[in-house]
Interface confidence: medium
């Protein structure tokens, strides 16, 4: 079972070789496409392969902001050629992500296909790591091999790479081991219950609040740190402000996501940025700690 997601992919190419990407769609180059063209071939060692975010079968929804669906295959190819002259193309791509059934906690193995010079899409963090503590996956690039498996998420502990234990391994060495891996990489992962934002832990409830700005401020102040796994919390509400008037948001509530973008593994600065660019309608996923009896 899969679900689809979209991402933006920026490729740097050159006028002579292009981006190493071949598209396929329709029967004739001049017929209007009824569905987005597919990536049918990725040239080895090309910008398209090296970015690590594209796979054969991905749907290209737009090229440099121009929708492909109502155009022709010839027009799509021309857009790519024109982009190559400028060395850069921005593709909006739709792809499939596996719906993995995985426990919210426990230790398991993940196998990922790996090619030379192609990143897996995993960022490792060693922020405030004490000796003997595991490395933490702090970010997973959207569209990457790691993301498409559907099993990995920020906050997962990375215990081993290809049976090489990482107990006392410096982060730089772990990154190097990941880079040098080829063909198939086996990652040993541990998920902890406290990593699962979705998990309704005892005495906590999570829900979504939609705020319509109408050009005004949200009326919330948030706090946290630049440590990727410290919680982002509501630290202040403007009196009679938009957020306070909902009655659903209170000081001390934890923000799990902003406009469906999870804050897991993200520092305070990124959360602030997400709020700044959120637009007129802002959806906040909130986790509230319910009062416990003494």
């Amino acid at each position: 079972i899969v679900h689809t997601e979209t991402t933006e992919v920026v490729l740097c190419g050159d006028p002579l070789s292009g981006f190493g990407l071949q598209l396929q769609g329709g029967i004739f180059a001049t017929e209007t496409l009824s569905s987005p063209p597919l990536v049918c071939f990725i040239e080895p060692d090309s910008p398209a392969e090296r970015c690590g975010l594209l796979q054969v079968g991905d749907r290209v929804l737009s090229i440099n902001g121009i929708a492909t669906e109502d155009g022709t295959m010839e027009e799509a190819n021309q857009l790519l050629r024109d982009a190559a002259l400028a060395h850069k193309v921005v593709l909006e791509v739709e792809f499939d992500v596996a719906e993995s059934v995985i426990p919210s906690s426990g230790t398991f193995h993940v196998k990922l296909p790996k090619k030379r010079s192609v990143e897996l899409g995993i960022t490792i963090s060693s922020a405030s790591r004490k000796r003997g503590e595991p490395l933490i996956i702090s970010d997973i690039k959207k569209g990457s091999v790691a993301h498409r498996t559907g099993t990995l998420e920020p906050g997962d502990k990375l215990l081993a790479i290809d049976n090489i234990r990482l107990d006392n391994c410096p982060m730089e060495d772990a990154v190097q081991i990941l880079r040098q891996c080829e063909d198939l990489v086996k990652l040993k992962i541990r998920k902890d219950e406290d990593n699962s934002d979705e998990l309704e832990t005892t005495g906590a409830v999570s829900y979504t609040v939609e705020l319509k700005r109408y050009g005004g401020p949200l009326g919330i102040t948030i706090s946290g740190t630049e440590e990727p796994f410290d919680p982002i919390v509501i630290s202040g509400l403007t009196k009679r402000g938009l957020a306070e008037r909902t009655g659903a948001i209170h000081v001390g509530d934890r923000i799990l996501a902003i406009n469906n973008v999870s804050l897991k593994g993200r520092p305070l600065s990124e959360a602030i940025h997400l709020l700044q660019v959120a637009g007129e309608t802002v959806t906040l996923k909130i986790k509230k700690q319910l009062d416990r009896p003494l």
Epitope: C12, G13, D14, L16, S46, P47
Partner: antibody, heavy 117, light 107 residues
Framework: EVQLLESGGGLVQPGGSLRLSCAAS????????MSWVRQAPGKGLEWVSA????????YYADSVKGRFTISRDNSKNTLYLQMNSLRAEDTAVYYC??????????WGQGTLVTVSS | DIQMTQSPSSLSASVGDRVTITCRAS??????LNWYQQKPGKAPKLLIY???SLQSGVPSRFSGSGSGTDFTLTISSLQPEDFATYYC?????????FGQGTKLEIK
């Protein structure tokens, strides 16, 4: 195995013409852009010209623009460099090379062009 | 046109030495920088492409780094067969210019 074999070099008088060829094998020729690079005796490398895989786009160094023409015949797996109005400073070993996104990954052994009266 | 400037133009070193050659572009070329090795009477050979990627079959003692305008080729431990001339080349925009070369000689 990728192979590039240049031919057509030789001695030519100033103002004369010469046509270099580069026979390619071991890869899908039409899928790759190709380039000519030259090296004057005892000097460094100088990029001369390049052509896209389809032959639709061509590029030249300022020093040869208007005098040299790069072309290809994908049915014959051959790259060409037509050199007209040759000058003494065009004397060099001419290499053909395959362009693979980030660099010239395969080179021929070179053919010497000498322009002298 | 983008000018590529290599330094030094010549260099004497011994087997086992660590050697660094630098290349500077007159404008930003992102990571579109390649390094070649050429021995007398032979065609150049691609060593490093895209600033830091090792070409297949090239020994791991060769490495490249940099982006934008400043780039470095490093040979971690010189071997007898490494004595040659090294060229950088930008493939960011045509004309695809080369540096003037660095001749690596035995001390």
């Amino acid at each position: 195995e990728v192979q590039l074999l240049e031919s057509g070099g030789g001695l030519v008088q100033p103002g004369g013409s010469l046509r270099l060829s580069c026979a390619a094998s071991g890869f899908t020729f039409s899928s790759y852009a190709m380039s000519w690079v030259r090296q004057a005796p005892g000097k460094g490398l100088e990029w001369v010209s390049a052509i896209s895989g389809s032959g639709g786009s061509t590029y030249y160094a300022d020093s040869v623009k208007g005098r040299f023409t790069i072309s290809r015949d994908n049915s014959k797996n051959t790259l060409y460099l037509q050199m007209n109005s040759l000058r003494a400073e065009d004397t060099a070993v001419y290499y053909c090379a395959r362009i693979h996104f980030y660099g010239l990954d395969y080179w021929g052994q070179g053919t010497l062009v000498t322009v002298s009266s | 046109d983008i000018q590529m400037t290599q330094s030094p133009s010549s260099l004497s070193a011994s087997v086992g030495d660590r050697v660094t050659i630098t290349c500077r572009a007159s404008q930003s070329i992102s990571s579109y920088l390649n390094w070649y090795q050429q021995k007398p009477g032979k065609a150049p050979k691609l060593l490093i492409y895209a600033a830091s990627s090792l070409q297949s079959g090239v020994p791991s003692r060769f490495s490249g780094s940099g982006s934008g305008t400043d780039f470095t080729l490093t040979i971690s431990s010189l071997q007898p067969e490494d004595f040659a001339t090294y060229y950088c080349q930008q493939s960011y925009s045509t004309p695809y210019t080369f540096g003037q070369g660095t001749k690596l000689e035995i001390k």
